[in-house]
């Protein structure tokens, strides 16, 4: 016999919530795998660019995205399938996963705050290497997409450490409309914008983390309530 009343409402709420979560994970995983396995990117992984080493931070970032996407899909599936099947085992596993993820988020938050300068440096390196790829291999659409995302999200273009060729390519092709890399090279420096994000706008990252944490707690409560509801309904 299935759950009834308010518990049934929780069941479908949990299903919808985790289906969206599973879809989001799928999108992240799909994009990350495209970035990783696109032939242009794969070729560049083994390439020495003159006297400059091949990009590596770019791939670390991609592997993190793959992991995040996979975990999201897995947890989303547990919540989604566990709710619709009214499986105490799956919901229990889902709850355990959420507890672990919550602990990881808290740990990552503390570590991130302590190492924010290093993270900012890595993000800048990630941007530089994506930019390097977009310039060196003009068919590397994945790298171009990453650069475009940086430029549009942070409303910046290039950095004060650009090579001559990168400056020229950016000036003609990759700056957001309305920005002029030559006159605004230092005003709209992406390195500066990244630094600003990790110092002056750190509260934004904090708010995002709190929102994620609240959602997790909310899901944990819902899964426990549903689990108890299933147990009670199976008794009668």
């Amino acid at each position: 016999m299935g759950v009834e009343g308010c518990t049934k409402c929780i069941k479908y709420l949990l299903f919808v919530f985790n289906f969206v979560f599973w879809l989001a994970g799928g999108v992240i995983l799909g994009v990350a795998l495209w970035l990783r396995h696109d032939p242009q990117t794969t070729n560049l992984l083994y390439l020495e660019l003159g006297d400059k080493p091949a990009p590596n931070t770019f791939y670390v970032g991609i592997y993190i995205l793959i992991a995040v996407g996979a975990v999201m899909m897995f947890v989303g599936f547990l919540g989604c399938y566990g709710a619709i099947q009214e499986s105490q085992c799956l919901l229990g596993t889902f709850f355990t996963c959420l507890v672990i993820l919550f602990a990881c988020e808290v740990a990552a938050g503390i570590w991130g705050f302590v190492n924010k300068d290093q993270i900012a440096k890595d993000v800048k390196q990630f941007y530089d290497q994506a930019l390097q790829q977009a310039v060196v291999d003009d068919d590397a659409n994945n790298a171009k997409a990453v650069v475009k995302t940086f430029h549009e999200t942070l409303d910046c273009c290039g950095s004060s450490t650009l090579t001559a060729l990168t400056t020229s390519v950016l000036k003609n092709n990759a700056c957001p409309s309305g920005s002029n890399i030559i006159s605004n090279l230092f005003k709209e420096d992406c390195h500066q914008k990244i630094d600003d994000l990790f110092s002056g706008k750190l509260y934004l990252i904090g708010i995002a983390a709190i929102v994620v944490a609240v959602i997790m707690i909310f899901e944990m409560i819902l899964s426990m309530v549903l689990c108890c509801g299933i147990r009670n309904s199976s008794v009668y």
Epitope: G50, V135, N173
Partner: antibody, heavy 119, light 112 residues
């Protein structure tokens, strides 16, 4: 060994057109940015244009913008420069040069081809 | 008039050390763009001599060295030899002109 061999230069009247070619060998042509650099008699070199490996990106010096067009054929390992509306000040030796991204400069140059614009 | 200013000539006797300067501005050398040096022997194409301000490509003798400070760069040739007699050009990128720029060249003469 990297080799770049220009051809197509010669005497042309003002307002005329000319197409320069550059045959490349000794390196992976399709993976490299290529450039044209010219040198007027008794003067220093002057950058003219560049083209990216798959022809996505191109740029020109202000002095030739709208008149010159750079292109490439990766299947033939050849770089081209189509020069229209030629002026007396375009008289120079035109060099084809490989652009090194790693070094951010012109690391190999051809022997050059002379273009003379005169009536 | 070139964007990068070089002395038109320089000279020295064999074994001597000669320095060639290249003066730019805040839109090229001073903007952080690398300076490169080319050697052009009579009747030949320019050949890369120094890249990235101070690096030598393989095959270039260590008698040639480069440096950069502020808005200018310099090329030093120590232990001068007769085969060093050539035209030397500096090169950088200029943000105002949105292109690569060269110096007017310095004719190095080895005396005696």
């Amino acid at each position: 060994e990297v080799q770049l061999l220009e051809s197509g230069g010669g005497l042309v009247q003002p307002g005329g057109s000319l197409r320069l070619s550059c045959a490349a060998s000794g390196f992976t042509f399709s993976s490299n940015y290529m450039s044209w650099v010219r040198q007027a008699p008794g003067k220093g070199p002057e950058w003219v244009s560049y083209i990216s490996s798959s022809s996505t990106y191109t740029d020109y010096a202000d002095s030739v913008k709208g008149r010159f067009t750079i292109s490439r054929d990766n299947s033939k390992n050849t770089l081209y420069l189509q020069m229209n509306s030629l002026r007396a000040e375009d008289t120079a030796v035109y060099y084809c040069a490989r652009y090194s991204y790693g070094r951010d400069n012109f690391d190999y140059w051809g022997q050059g081809t002379l273009v003379t614009v005169s009536s | 008039q070139s964007v990068l200013t070089q002395p038109s000539s320089a000279s020295g006797t064999p074994g001597q050390r000669v320095t060639i300067s290249c003066t730019g501005s805040t839109s090229n050398i001073g903007a952080g763009y690398d300076t490169h040096w080319y050697q052009q022997l009579p009747g030949t194409a320019p050949k890369l001599l120094i890249y990235g301000n101070s690096n030598r490509p393989s095959g270039v003798p260590d008698r040639f060295s480069g440096s950069k400070s502020g808005t200018s760069a310099s090329l030093a040739v120590s232990g001068l030899r007769s085969e060093d007699e050539a035209e030397y050009y500096c090169q950088s990128y200029d943000t105002n002109l949105s292109g690569w720029v060269f110096g007017g060249g310095t004719k190095l003469t080895v005396l005696g």
